[in-house]
């Protein structure tokens, strides 16, 4: 799996999970989230050569096509596969609210 | 939806469905498929600016982050959303076989 266990420990220019910290205020301008200050969101990046973690039959077809016709820019792309939620604390007036924001943290990647 | 009805009728540099015909022999080197000779596979391509058909909360976060730090290459990517199968005819010896290959045709796209 193209997850932290593999990607963070290897030199990998192909599609893989990359670490990325997001600071809510600084990076997104979101001042409404009280806690946490930010979080390890991660992201997916890298090339998708033929058979590199292809998600579907179409992505396999496309990566094979791309080896023959690279100028067509019709290659698969490295995107998130498994995502996890993030629990946040915010306030409505003086009332604290705890909420789970779904699909905030990328855990693994795929070529799609 | 970023499908043929919208994308093929509009000039759209952002993430959208793009037409692509794949010839099995010429483009993939697949000589085993008897019919069809090829098919309209389509593919997804284009930029994923903030809120352009974002698939998840993470892709929305990422596209917003990317406006501030484009050099990070941490932007969402335009990938397939809905896919359809393709029915093919091939031979095992002289015996014709009809099979449905799943996820062969892209019908719509998303930023993920």
């Amino acid at each position: 799996a193209l997850d932290a266990a593999y990607c963070f420990r290897n030199v990998q220019d192909n599609c893989c999970l990359r670490p990325l910290y997001i600071d809510f205020k600084r990076d997104l301008g979101w001042k409404w989230i009280h806690e946490p200050k930010g979080y390890n969101a991660n992201f997916c990046a890298g090339a998708c050569p033929y058979l590199w973690s292809s998600d579907t039959q179409h992505s396999r077809v496309l990566s094979l096509y791309n080896t023959i016709n690279p100028e067509a820019s019709a290659s698969p792309c490295c995107v998130s596969q498994d995502l996890e939620p993030l629990t946040i604390l915010y306030y409505i007036g003086k009332t604290p609210k705890i909420e789970q924001l779904s699909n905030m943290i990328v855990k693994s990647c795929k070529c799609s | 939806a970023l499908d043929a009805a919208y994308c093929f009728r509009n000039v759209q540099d952002n993430c959208c469905l793009r037409p692509l015909y794949i010839d099995f022999k010429r483009d993939l080197g697949w000589k085993w498929i008897h019919e069809p000779k090829g098919y309209n596979a389509n593919f997804c391509a284009g930029a994923c600016p903030y809120l352009w058909s974002s698939d998840t909360q993470h892709s929305r976060v990422l596209s917003l982050y990317n406006t501030i730090n484009p050099e990070a290459s941490a932007s969402p990517c335009c990938v397939s959303q809905d896919l359809e199968p393709l029915t093919i005819l091939y031979y095992i010896g002289k015996t014709p076989k009809i099979e449905q290959l799943s996820n062969m045709i892209v019908k719509s796209c998303k930023c993920s």
Partner: antibody, heavy 119, light 107 residues
Amino acid sequence: EVQLQESGPGLVKPSETLSLTCTVSGFSLTTYNVHWVRQPPGKGLEWMGLIWNTGGTRYNSALKSRLTISKDTSKSQVSLKLSSVTAADTAVYYCARDPVPNKWHFDFWGPGTLVTVSS
Amino acid sequence: EIVMTQSPATLSVSPGERATLSCLASEDIYSNLAWYQQKPGQSPRLLIYDARSLQDGVPARFSGSESGPEYTLTISSLQSEDFAVYFCQQHHAYPFTFGQGTKVEIK
């Protein structure tokens, strides 16, 4: 063990190009970002620029026209090139790593290498 | 760019005493501040990040706090190995900038 090590000529002539290499071990350049920071003798620290795990770069605008940072992931090396140097570029040059990309503070530093600009 | 102003330039303290170093940001940096220790001939060492988070392996006598635009590094009981130069750094906006440093010397 995470390590960074700067190397390059200790003496560069004015108007020439300063070239340094940072060789890293214990982590991957496709996972972490690497920054360059310099310190003129007896003075404070100046952030010069960085190269992302994905290969993109960001430079201090004061140096942007003269600075190029690149990397060779297979060799675990990051390179710095600073053109048209003057005596004001005399400094100890450090490469450093941020603990998570976009955290922007530096948890591991190289020992530094002194570069003197003089004819 | 964001200007970081440290005070005092030099702080004379006896071993075992408390040391308080200040860093003032020219604009809001939302707690995105780090503190480093540097000894002669050595590279900087990260002590504190996010204004108050202690870096792994750093003794608990080091602590960070903030009050508005002013950030403080406190060394509760100075040890002989703590005499050095201390730099603050904002990690909020490009270009990342450092204070000019505070030298902590033996009184």
